[in-house]
Interface confidence: medium
């Protein structure tokens, strides 16, 4: 049989058939099923859900569905010794205590095993001292405090508002500033959209609502005790003192009712400007300590959480490819939630479930994809992307040789305004072409394409008539595949209007109020946005697994490489004298980018013209496309971040959620004027430029004609 016959038994088994099989009603039903009880990583409930998904994926028609388990470090509050924060008077008496739990939403009062709000992996401790308000606890916030305001956080408990950057970066910054504890809180300015009621009457955060979350700084390591290797039964485990990424000071999250009580008494310095003031009726003084009448009062944290090695379970489903079974396209999203997971992750897991069902239906009718599709339900994402990372560590040799693409499938929605896509430049054209074929679910865009509504609502800052696609950062399960292994990756979800909704994430993120009802009542009653996300994610997987020629366009990489080179050069040019003094030149990098552009252009011409019926030639060209992302991997990794190995992209050192381009050069240049040893600092810039130059040139050469 020819390859086209093997993968298309009848003409109807094409992408349209796959997309038509996806049903909003099914996604709704699956979401309801997945959100009735908590599915915290490491718990019996989440193990039972794993077994249910395994059973259903088998019923849907996958060739095999396996549970893979790992024993990883997780963190839980002490059930008999709750965490809280108090204000104490000069006699040490507690005159105010923060709440011990979130008031559960109506209908969920009798649900057991709702984990109270906590910061996962916080060490135990009971620090007490004066409070310093540090805004979002970003790098620039601590610069403002220490350098401009001359405020010393050493020995102080800092209070920071959630938002803008990953909470782990906030904690790391506080540690470096010498703080003895961190209190994280949700300010209404960031988590209460004007004109919307709080849950259960709307989608805003109530005063007793609290955001849970891990506070690790893993930098891609996975399980803190087994960096680089799977946490299996024969793994060597580090001692807790040598574990990767654990915070060294106690941390605890609170809601804005409790935050009000702490912040209203703050004295010391006034906030530097309006960007430091939230929406509470408090002065937003920085401190340190409380004002006049309350100056003898202190804040005390009581943290008793424990970290323990616990078993987690991934579900891995396989749909074997008919022609290239040794080429893997992976669709993965996590299953574990902080509580009910109404949005995070189950809005994503429900979409994956429906995508599996649709693929299974086609398979039962005799169709197979050209390449193998792997479906994954990851565990312990909330505890540091542990399930996906351990599985990738265990299968790294297979993945680096066979991995075509990874599509992530966490929360399908974080709003209902427009599409949001982050992906490798290799997938830009795939995403544009796919969204031109899909119908927009947006009001006012009836009968128009998703591409059109997306472009109108989220235009590209560089190219008119095109939508914005962002860089991949981290904070989700694509991290190990993209940043460590160099497998082309992408993610898509429906998002909010970033122009009018300045708050960070969605207000009820990681709270007990993230329920099925939140989605069904306020975000997507018809589940039309969920269906659209299923079509985008599923359509990408279908094309990646079934196109004869991989739907990657290397010319789009050339375009962004030039943009990123310009950007980093302009950053460096803020130091013209030093560039002259230390003979810093970007000429080599620009030359490599030019070479890449020319070679990519020639490759694309050959790709267009070659004989697609020649299986050897086809496989050769596809391998060049598949391995292009891999060519951007430096086996030595980035400085001090060995598991971030992609030279073009890495999570920002200041915000794990954000992607940074040419991260090695960027970090070498960051705050360079404050480095004691300029010769050494600019030497490192030059070293990083040379690494980037080599990598771009080497990647270009993988696209050259083979002989």
């Amino acid at each position: 049989k020819s390859s086209s016959e093997a993968t298309n038994i009848t003409p109807k088994h094409n992408m349209k058939a796959f997309l038509d099989e996806l049903k909003a009603e099914n996604i709704k039903k699956f979401l309801h099923n997945f959100t009735q009880i908590p599915h915290l990583a490491g718990t019996e409930q989440n193990f039972q859900l794993a077994k249910q998904i395994q059973s259903q994926w088998k019923e849907f028609g996958l060739d095999s569905v396996e549970l893979t388990h790992y024993d990883v470090l997780l963190s839980y509050p002490n059930k008999t010794h709750p965490n809280y924060i108090s204000i104490i008077n000069e006699d040490g008496n507690e005159i105010f205590n923060t709440s011990l739990f979130e008031p559960p939403p109506a209908g969920y009062e009798n649900v057991s095993d709702i984990v109270p709000p906590f910061s996962a992996f916080s060490p135990q401790g009971m620090p007490e001292g004066d409070l310093v308000y540090v805004n979002y606890a970003r790098t620039e916030d601590f610069f403002k405090l220490e350098r401009d305001m001359k405020i010393n956080c050493s020995g102080k408990i800092v209070i920071a508002r959630y938002g803008k950057v990953f909470r782990g970066n906030k904690v790391k910054n506080a540690q470096l500033a010498g703080a003895t504890g961190v209190i994280l809180y949700s300010d209404p300015a960031d988590y209460f959209a004007p004109g919307v009621k709080s849950y259960p009457d709307g989608w805003n955060l109530p005063g007793g609502g609290v955001q849970r979350g891990n506070i690790l700084n893993l930098n891609g390591a996975g399980d803190p005790l087994t960096p680089g290797y799977p946490a299996n039964e024969y793994a060597y485990r580090r001692g807790i003192a040598e574990a990767v990424g654990l915070p060294s000071i106690p941390v605890h999250p609170i809601g804005y009712y409790d935050a009000q009580k702490l912040l209203e008494k703050m004295g010391g310095s006034a906030s530097p400007d309006s960007s430091w003031r939230g929406s509470l009726k408090v002065p937003y003084n920085v401190g340190p300590g409380f004002t006049g009448n309350f100056s003898t009062q202190k804040v005390k944290m009581h943290i008793h959480s424990t970290s323990e090695v616990t078993r987690i379970y991934n579900v891995i489903g396989t749909l074997r490819g008919a022609v290239e079974p040794d080429r893997y396209v992976i669709l993965g999203g996590h299953r574990d939630s902080w509580v009910f997971g109404g949005i995070d992750p189950q809005s994503g897991a429900a979409v994956v479930h429906e995508i599996v069902r649709s693929f299974g239906t086609l398979k039962k009718e005799g169709w197979r994809p050209r390449r193998t599709i792997l479906f994954a339900s990851w565990d312990a994402e909330e505890f540091g992307l542990l399930g996906s990372t351990e599985w990738a560590e265990e299968n790294s040799r297979l993945l680096q040789e066979r991995g075509v693409a990874y599509i992530n499938a966490d929360s399908s929605i974080e709003g209902n305004y427009t599409l949001r896509v982050d992906c490798t430049p290799l997938m830009y054209s795939l995403v544009y072409n796919l969204t031109k074929e899909l119908e927009s679910p947006d009001e006012g865009f009836e009968g128009k394409s998703l591409y059109e509504s997306w472009t109108k609502k989220s235009p590209s800052p560089e190219f008119s008539g095109m939508p914005r696609i962002s860089k991949l950062g981290s904070g989700n399960d694509f991290e190990v595949f993209f940043q460590r292994l160099g497998i082309a990756s992408g993610r898509a979800r429906y998002t909010k209007n970033w122009e009018t909704n300045k708050f960070s994430s969605y207000p009820l993120y990681h709270s007990v109020y993230e329920t099925y009802e939140l989605v069904e009542k306020f975000y997507d009653p018809m589940f039309k946005y969920h269906l659209t996300v299923a079509q985008v994610r599923g359509g990408m997987v279908f094309e990646l697994a079934n196109s004869v020629v991989l739907p990657f366009d290397c010319r789009d990489y050339a375009v962004v490489l030039r943009k990123y080179a310009d950007k980093i050069y302009n950053i460096s040019m803020k130091h013209p004298q030093e560039m002259k003094t230390y003979s810093v030149s970007f000429d080599s990098l620009f030359s490599a980018v030019k070479n890449f552009t020319e070679i990519a252009s020639k490759f694309s011409e050959r790709l267009r013209d070659f004989d697609k019926s020649n299986p050897i030639l086809l496989r050769m060209m596809n391998d060049q496309l598949m391995f292009l992302e891999r060519a951007f991997i430096d086996p030595l990794g980035l400085p001090d971040r060995p598991f971030y190995r992609h030279v073009i992209y890495a999570p920002s050192s200041h915000n794990k959620y954000a992607g940074e381009s040419f991260p090695g050069i960027y970090d070498a240049l960051f705050d360079i004027e404050s480095k004691v040893d300029p010769s050494q600092a600019w030497g490192e810039v030059k070293r990083q430029i040379s690494i980037a130059t080599f990598t771009v040139q080497a990647a270009a050469e993988t696209l050259s004609e083979v002989a």
């Epitope: 010393n152 020995g155 010498g178 130091h575 004027e673 404050s674 300029p678």
Partner: antibody, heavy 119, light 112 residues
Amino acid sequence: QVQLVETGGGLVRPGNSLKLSCVTSGFTFSNYRMHWLRQPPGKRLEWIAVITVKSDNYGSSYAESVKGRFAISRDDSKSSVYLEMNRLREEDTATYFCSRELGQVLVFWGQGTLVTVSA
Amino acid sequence: DVVVTQTPLSLPVSLGDQASISCRSSQSLVHSYGNTYLHWYLQKPGQSPKLLIYKVSNRFSGVPDRFSGSGSGTDFTLKISRVEAEDLGVYFCSQTTHVPWTFGGGTKLEIK
């Protein structure tokens, strides 16, 4: 390379004034705090003044021994720092150095200029 | 003011020998931020001081690895593992934890 060159030293009578200049090159001058130090013949180094950067409103600070008599200033456009010395005393005799600070470390120094105060 | 005392005043050595210079401060040099701002310089006749070691133990660029710094609190040491001819001159330590910044009296490293 980073260079700092002091000029303006010389022989001066007690009670008179002198202005020292320090011209720099090889780094973006406006980003850095600048200091003056001195070393009397055969004695230990003594820190005498610092001037901060524009974002800190060019704040300055002095050693007790020169407070009220010496004034530090800078001209970012000329990549230069100055030390205006008034009411000079014989004990001000020393080699005067300018230095670029970073993170509480005096990293680069000029070669020094000799000031002799003598009747 | 913090008084910084250096010993010895003079240190005669043979080339290839190890040299050790001590620096003691009248109060702890641990800054409230946790860093210790104690630095070592070498000054050759008629030249400006050159930074060797900053913040106790960090070698400045271009400084050979035969130079090392150690210590904490109030007691610090500069070691030269194998003295070479180019190492001769006056070494002094400096503290920048407390204002005003102060300097040791210097140690003259000379050939025996």
